[in-house]
Interface confidence: low
Amino acid sequence: PYGAPAGPLIVPYNLPLPGGVVPRMLITILGTVKPNANRIALDFQRGNDVAFHFNPRFNENNRRVIVCNTKLDNNWGREERQSVFPFESGKPFKIQVLVEPDHFKVAVNDAHLLQYNHRVKKLNEISKLGISGDIDLTSASYTMI
């Protein structure tokens, strides 16, 4: 796998994706949710755009929800919301994002969570993954499967 070595990483963290993403690329993020966490965010970036924003929110109007979206030309698009919420404050997690030809597939702690259809079609230009939020980040890496 390519990416950051295991060990504490500074958040927000920036994982370069040289050459962009391609189908069958698997991105794995390991960490621990901080106590009383508010949010986590993964941002797959294409230049100034966010191709895929994966945003678990621990307390949105007293509800836990995962919001996915795309940001183009500084405008957020239509939100896709997921009420299944596998993250727990203070607990370790594993997020895996599998790139498929027409969507991202996200699994958390080895269980499928959601898929998000590509709104940015030029996958080869999605060249960075930003990781931010209330987490202690252990590692971030990618490999082909």
Epitope: I10, N14, P16, N38, K128, S132
Partner: antibody, heavy 120, light 110 residues
């Protein structure tokens, strides 16, 4: 409109204390990391401290450790900097700054600054 | 003394391109840490021009570009204009979770 407004800067004697405040508006304050950055007259920018949205991750520059304390009140959309044991070399404009996950941690919103003068 | 090293000044004529360097170490610029660039006009607050090494915030001219190679980051301004005359600062996270700034570079338009 996204805005940060600092207050609390004044003339203080060496060894004295001061509390700076920053009022945030136009964005979800609790989502973002906040920072204090200062700039002495005619000098460059100097990062002082940062605090995450939930006040659990707090970092300081070595030159203020033990003297300055950063804090925030998300209910009031406010950021604070308590400065103790002030020295002449702490004289500077103090900026309240947001660093957003949507800008890769870049400090994308700055206040106008508040002037702190330490002199006898 | 700044941890990141920038030239004290650079100059260029209108229409030309200039590059400002920002030299660090493997503990800051050379690590997987985001480098940002800020522009500051006299008497004004700094403005974010580049983040995550090479990305421009909305509203920043595409004449500004950033890059990073090894322990050195660079800001390039093409097609220089009079309003580009300002101080420019680089910044990076460090391996101990702090942030550091460069000493600043004064850009003069001849």
């Amino acid at each position: 409109e996204v805005q940060l407004v600092e207050s609390g800067g004044s003339l203080v004697k060496p060894g004295g204390s001061l509390r700076l405040s920053c009022a945030a508006s136009g964005f979800t304050f609790s989502n973002d990391d906040m920072n204090w950055v200062r700039q002495a007259p005619g000098k460059g920018l100097e990062w002082i401290s940062s605090i995450d949205g939930s006040s659990r991750s707090i970092y300081y520059a070595d030159f203020v450790k033990g003297r300055f304390t950063i804090s925030r009140d998300n209910a009031k959309n406010s950021l604070y900097l308590q400065m103790n044991s002030l020295r002449a070399e702490d004289t500077a404009v103090y900026y309240c700054v947001r660093s957003s996950g949507y800008s890769g941690g870049g400090m994308d919103v700055w206040g106008r600054g508040t002037l702190v003068t330490v002199s006898s | 003394q700044s941890v990141l090293t920038q030239p004290a000044s650079v100059s260029g004529s209108p229409g030309q391109s200039i590059t400002i360097s920002c030299a660090g170490t493997s503990s800051d610029v050379g690590g997987s840490y985001n480098v940002a660039w800020y522009q500051q006009h006299p008497g004004k607050a700094p403005k974010l021009m580049i983040y995550s090494d090479s990305y421009r915030p909305s509203g920043v001219s595409n004449r500004f570009s950033g890059s990073k190679s090894g322990n050195t980051a660079s800001l390039t301004i093409s097609g220089l204009q009079a309003e580009d005359e300002a101080d420019y600062y680089c910044s990076s996270y460090t391996s101990n979770s702090a942030r550091v700034f460069g000493g600043g570079t004064k850009l003069e338009i001849k």
